[in-house]
């Protein structure tokens, strides 16, 4: 956090994550400005010589980037005078990890915060009952997860039960050979239960949840991020 | 209003240079990427490259790289497009096309009329 | 570098019908496909980005999906004005590339 005071305004900003080849956003706030043209953002990469991203007199200054970050930042231009610094990132890769200082200056003085960004891969999980199974399965996939994840199934009615004995997890390479599908299968279930399957590394945890009755079947799926957050 | 509008066409003889503007207006010119592409007759689209006029970094097709050079001038808000050692494969129609997402590049979401450049002896 | 194999080159259909193009990507996972409609003698249109994002005024009619290296474009209901030509652009990559396209022409 920035120093409140003459000359120093608090810059926000939250850990975050990102998945990789997809885009990715690094989040700052500072107090709002009016006069854009005095707003100075400045984004920077702990062990990175040059700049991630400059935005000065309402415009992007991108002559000091380093090449690493050549046509794949953006700040919110629109938005800037609100407050706003986050930093729209393309193409989110592994190597993208790492410390970033978000530095601003306005006319009411200057300020700083550093963001931790990690990145890897995570996705929802899709949970159908296996009727090609011998008994009544069901099959949990994801399609990309790094670094490799773990996988646990639970149910409503059998609470605190191991299933690890009744299940069978696999990690398959994707073909960009970093990132992995995850399959679990689960077996020997019973209908009229909710059973949950929760892929988790450590930058996100994702449940599947379905409910199998003799009638329908309701599936919900919910991923959260960890350690996201000032 | 985004408009992207070209110069007009040309015939030129093998070997021989062209050299093809783009003019842009309705935004801030040194703000976007704008990448150029091409397309023969009855032929695919082919991208060639693109740049970035406020500071003038490009990237290439490999395929044309040494025969083809893309500069702007930010007094006139003109990207230009260089082909040299022409040769017959080379007629096609050029179009520029401004690049979505400001200094981060986009899709091409606004383009320019077209030029069409013949190459023939 | 990433390529882009559009199929099928062509294809026929009627007025009504659902059609759907494919793109495969030579390598890789990233979600930056875009679309176009080419029309004879003019400049592309942009339809979908980011692999299913809807450009403002496209008709929804149109839709995107796809991950990995498979992408796909549909037309729900194809009408009149959509016998087109259709491209692919993936734009992730620092070398752009586009597939070799997909003449819709009326059976």
């Known amino acids: 956090f920035g120093i409140s005071g003459k000359h120093f305004i608090t810059v926000t900003t939250f850990t975050s994550a990102g998945n990789i080849g997809e885009d990715g956003t690094l989040s700052c706030t500072f107090e709002p400005d009016i006069k854009l043209n005095g707003i100075v953002i400045q984004w920077l990469k702990e062990g990175i010589k040059g700049l991630v991203h400059e935005f000065k007199e309402g415009k992007d200054d991108l002559s000091q980037q380093h090449e690493m970050f050549r046509g794949r930042t953006a700040v919110f231009a629109d938005q800037v005078v609100v407050g706003n610094a986050s930093l729209r990132l393309k193409n989110v890769q592994l190597t993208d990890a790492g410390t970033y200082t978000c530095y601003i200056r306005t006319s009411k003085g200057k300020g700083n915060a550093n963001l931790e960004y990690k990145t890897g891969a995570f996705s929802m999980p899709e949970i159908n009952v296996d009727y090609n199974a011998s008994s009544e399965s069901l099959r949990c996939e994801a399609p990309r997860w790094f670094p490799q994840p773990t996988v646990a199934w639970a149910s409503q009615v059998d609470q605190g039960a191991n299933f690890s004995e009744v299940s069978n997890t696999s990690f398959e390479l994707n073909s960009e050979n970093v990132t992995m599908k995850v399959v679990s299968v689960l077996y020997n279930v019973t209908i009229n239960n909710t059973y949950s399957c929760m892929i988790e590394n450590d930058i996100a945890k994702a449940t599947g949840d379905i409910k199998v009755t003799d009638s329908e079947v309701k599936r919900r799926s919910q991923l959260q991020l960890l350690n996201s957050g000032p | 209003e985004v408009q992207l509008v070209q110069s007009g066409a040309e015939v030129k003889k093998p070997g021989a240079s062209v050299k093809v503007s783009c003019k842009a207006s309705?935004?801030?010119?040194?703000?976007?990427?704008i990448g150029w592409v091409r397309q023969a007759p009855g032929q695919g689209l082919e991208w060639i490259g693109d740049?970035?006029?406020?500071?003038?970094?490009?990237n290439y097709n490999e395929k044309f790289k040494g025969r083809v050079t893309i500069t702007r001038d930010t007094s006139t808000s003109t990207a230009y497009l260089e082909l040299s050692s022409l040769r017959s494969e080379d007629t096609a129609v050029y179009y520029c096309?401004?690049?979505?997402?400001?200094?981060?590049?986009?899709?091409?979401?606004?383009w320019g009329q077209g030029t069409l450049v013949t190459v023939s002896s | 570098d990433i390529q882009m194999t559009q199929s099928p080159s062509s294809l026929s259909a009627s007025v009504g019908d659902r059609v759907t193009i494919t793109c495969k990507a030579s390598?890789?996972?990233?979600?930056?496909v875009a679309w176009y409609q080419q029309k004879p003698g003019k400049a592309p249109k942009l339809l979908i980005y980011?692999?299913?994002t809807l450009q403002p005024g496209v008709p929804s009619r149109f839709s995107g999906s796809g991950s990995g290296r498979d992408y796909t474009l549909t037309i729900s209901s194809l009408q009149p004005e959509d016998f087109a030509t259709y491209y692919c652009?993936?734009?992730?990559?620092?070398?752009?590339?586009f597939g070799q396209g997909t003449k819709v022409e009326i059976k």
């Open positions: 096309a401004r690049l979505d997402g400001s200094s981060y590049r986009g899709a091409m979401d606004s």
């Open positions: 309705g935004y801030t010119f040194t703000s976007y990427w």
């Open positions: 740049i970035y006029p406020g500071g003038g970094y490009t």
């Open positions: 390598q890789g996972f990233n979600k930056y």
């Open positions: 980011y692999t299913s």
């Open positions: 652009l993936q734009y992730g990559d620092l070398l752009y590339a």
